[in-house]
Amino acid sequence: RADPCAARPCAHGGRCYAHFSGLVCACAPGYMGARCEFPVHPDGASALPAAPPGLRPGDPQRYL
């Protein structure tokens, strides 16, 4: 199977980990979100929107 991390799914230097159950992004310092797309504000808050229906923020996201 092709390496799903080769598509570089994680933004802002996030580390992609692939597994048979999906892939996850370990976000670099200062970023958060399923794909590390959101900056963490200095006060620790974030501009993170609500998770899409049926997806909890920490869940692995399946790849095809």
Partner: antibody, heavy 115, light 112 residues
Framework: QVQLVQSGAEVKKPGSSVKVSCKAS????????ISWVRQAPGQGLEWMGG????????NYAQKFQDRVTITADKSTNTAYMELTSLTSEDTAVYYC????????WGRGTMVTVSS | DIVMTQSPLSSPVTLGQPASISCRSS???????????LNWLQQRPGQPPRLLIY???NPFSGVPDRFSGSGAGTDFTLKISRVEAEDVGVYYC?????????FGPGTKVEIK
């Protein structure tokens, strides 16, 4: 602010086992690797193994493969490292760290193996 | 396993002078996601390690700007532009591109 809080110091007999815990206080372990690193007195850092809690799969350094088990409990945001068949050579400070960026470290747990 | 080497292993420096530490990996640290997971850690006596630089050259928050990292592929460098007394300790490079993660042997920085 996430912190990694480790269990307290242990004194163990040769041949016994030790289980050290590492709790993410104020946050989640989620998709990071929680690594276990040990440091014998006066020595350098040695990576023992790590787990990605969201997957539940662990990776181990070959040196420790037969003696170490790393687990994680997502419900309590806690990772565990169990080392078996202890000898005096296992006397060390054991750290947990959040990888791949090594941006969070526990304070360390001193494990002393002595008869 | 990827083997990490460092030089020098000991570096006596004069306060206010620069210091440089080299780190080499036995194979490329470029991950399939395009990033290079090479970190620099500082360990002061009696303390846990502390992140200075991640992904070769990104300074961690709160790290003084006298610390900088550079390099690519298999060759990396940590530079301290002007050494201060609080910089005394052991510096480690570490790779997290591939399991098992591995550390360099450490470089001890001391004041002359």
């Amino acid at each position: 602010q996430v912190q990694l809080v480790q269990s307290g110091a242990e004194v163990k007999k040769p041949g016994s086992s030790v289980k050290v815990s590492c709790k993410a206080s104020g946050g989640t372990l989620s998709s990071y690797v929680i690594s276990w690193v040990r440091q014998a007195p006066g020595q350098g850092l040695e990576w023992m193994g790590g787990i990605i809690p969201i997957f539940g799969t662990a990776n181990y350094a070959q040196k420790f493969q037969d003696r170490v088990t790393i687990t994680a409990d997502k419900s309590t945001n806690t990772a565990y490292m169990e080392l078996t068949s202890l000898t005096s050579e296992d006397t060390a400070v054991y750290y947990c760290a959040r990888d791949p960026f090594s941006d969070l470290w526990g304070r360390g747990t001193m494990v002393t193996v002595s008869s | 396993d990827i083997v990490m080497t460092q030089s020098p292993l000991s570096s006596p420096v004069t306060l206010g002078q620069p210091a440089s530490i080299s780190c080499r990996s036995s194979q490329s640290l470029v991950h399939s996601d395009g990033n290079t997971y090479l970190n620099w850690l500082q360990q002061r006596p009696g303390q846990p390690p502390r992140l200075l630089i991640y992904q070769i050259s990104n300074p961690f928050s709160g790290v003084p700007d006298r610390f900088s990292g550079s390099g690519a592929g298999t060759d990396f460098t940590l530079k301290i532009s002007r050494v201060e007394a609080e910089d005394v300790g052991v510096y480690y490079c570490m790779q997290a591109t591939q399991f098992p993660h591995t550390f360099g042997p450490g470089t001890k920085v001391e004041i002359k």
